[in-house]
């Protein structure tokens, strides 16, 4: 029988994955540094814009793919360039933890934009 249309990852699934990769972790991706981003400017695409530059790190590939799927479903998502702090670099683990905190807040308040 024909396969169903692919469901995008849910906010809950993203949270579960972010928890999974950050728990009991002091570092991720060998301490790789990424640009800090303003998550209020379209959190999925903003986070992806920074994290997409991380390679050779299997730990965050699932997160990258989830963000890509969520960013892809936004209207004209590829056109939006998120606000990025070009003078501030932080560790991958810090960005992921920031994203987790932000996404949890969005989830709690039911604002799934």
């Amino acid at each position: 029988s024909p396969s169903p249309v692919t469901p995008s990852p849910t906010l809950k699934e993203l949270i579960e994955e972010l928890v999974n990769i950050t728990q009991n972790q002091a570092s991720l991706c060998n301490g790789s540094m990424v640009w800090s981003v303003n998550l209020t400017a379209g959190m999925y695409c903003a986070a992806l814009e920074s994290l997409i530059n991380v390679s050779d790190c299997s730990a965050i590939q699932r997160t990258q793919r989830m963000l890509k799927a969520l960013c892809s479903q936004k209207p004209a998502a590829g056109q939006i360039s998120s606000e990025r702090s070009r003078d501030t670099k932080i560790e991958v683990i810090q960005l992921v933890k920031n994203l987790l905190t932000y996404v949890r807040g969005v989830y709690r308040h039911g604002n799934f934009r």
């Epitope: 396969s3 692919t6 990852p9 992806l48 814009e49 997409i52 530059n53 390679s55 050779d56 299997s58 590939q61 699932r62 990258q64 793919r65 890509k68 799927a69 960013c71 892809s72 004209a76 998502a77 590829g78 056109q79 360039s81």
Partner: antibody, heavy 119, light 107 residues
């Protein structure tokens, strides 16, 4: 060494289904998704979708309008691609591939499986 | 879907010269472009990811550049083994999409 070995060439009738397998070795199967890409004769590459063997999550190219089903068998480290309602436009070489270094950039490819649709 | 337009469709280069292939995206894909080479009867081989990063084992004669919508693959000091079809891929957005390809031949 990462190896992806695909099943042999298939000849199918219009309207039938085909199931191509991709047996993997040399890496941990559940660590990376399996991508499927096809190439019609003398044409370019077309991404069909991927499956994450870790949790069964899939992403499909909607151009295939639900005709593609991707599955993975963790016990044998084998991925499968099934394409239904075959037509002449589906004649192509079908590839499985994995992306290890960069997310969604397929650097390890199977040898390809030619699927022919003929009445 | 993001459309990738590759130019030229074919390219004839003398050994030792430089070949340049362009890939233009229909929308901003940041630096998420990869390049592949495919020889007749073979599977594609990944050369470059994230616009400018070479895979292990790929000669430094291959270089990628660009961001946003305009990307270029350069092959300097072209050798006989560089012939084949070259494809770009955008890996910013789903569905992943490829350019139509550029055939590189030796003069």
């Amino acid at each position: 060494e990462v190896q992806l070995v695909q099943s042999g060439a298939e000849v199918k009738k219009p309207g039938a289904s085909v199931k191509v397998s991709c047996k993997t070795s040399g890496y941990t199967f559940i660590d990376y998704p399996m991508y499927w890409v096809r190439q019609a004769p003398g044409a370019g590459l077309e991404w069909m979708g991927y499956i994450d063997p870790y949790n069964g999550a899939t992403s499909y190219n909607q151009n295939f309008k639900g005709r593609v089903t991707l599955t993975a068998d963790k016990s044998t480290s084998t991925a499968y691609m099934e394409l239904s309602s075959l037509r002449a436009g589906d004649i192509a070489v079908y590839y499985c591939a994995t992306a290890v270094v960069a997310t969604d950039v397929m650097e390890n490819w199977g040898q390809g499986t030619l699927v022919t649709v003929s009445s | 879907d993001i459309v990738l337009t590759q130019t030229p469709l074919s390219l004839s280069v003398s050994p030792g010269e430089t070949a340049s292939i362009s890939c233009k995206a229909s929308q901003n894909v940041r630096n998420a472009v990869a390049w592949f080479r495919q020889k007749p009867g073979q599977s594609p081989q990944a050369l470059i990811y994230l616009a400018s990063n070479r895979y292990t084992g790929v000669p430094d004669r291959f270089s990628g550049s660009g961001s946003g919508t305009d990307f270029t693959l350069r092959i300097s000091r072209v050798e006989a083994e560089d012939t084949g079809d070259y494809f770009c891929l955008q890996h910013w957005n789903y569905p992943l999409t490829f350019g139509a390809g550029t055939k590189v031949e030796l003069k």
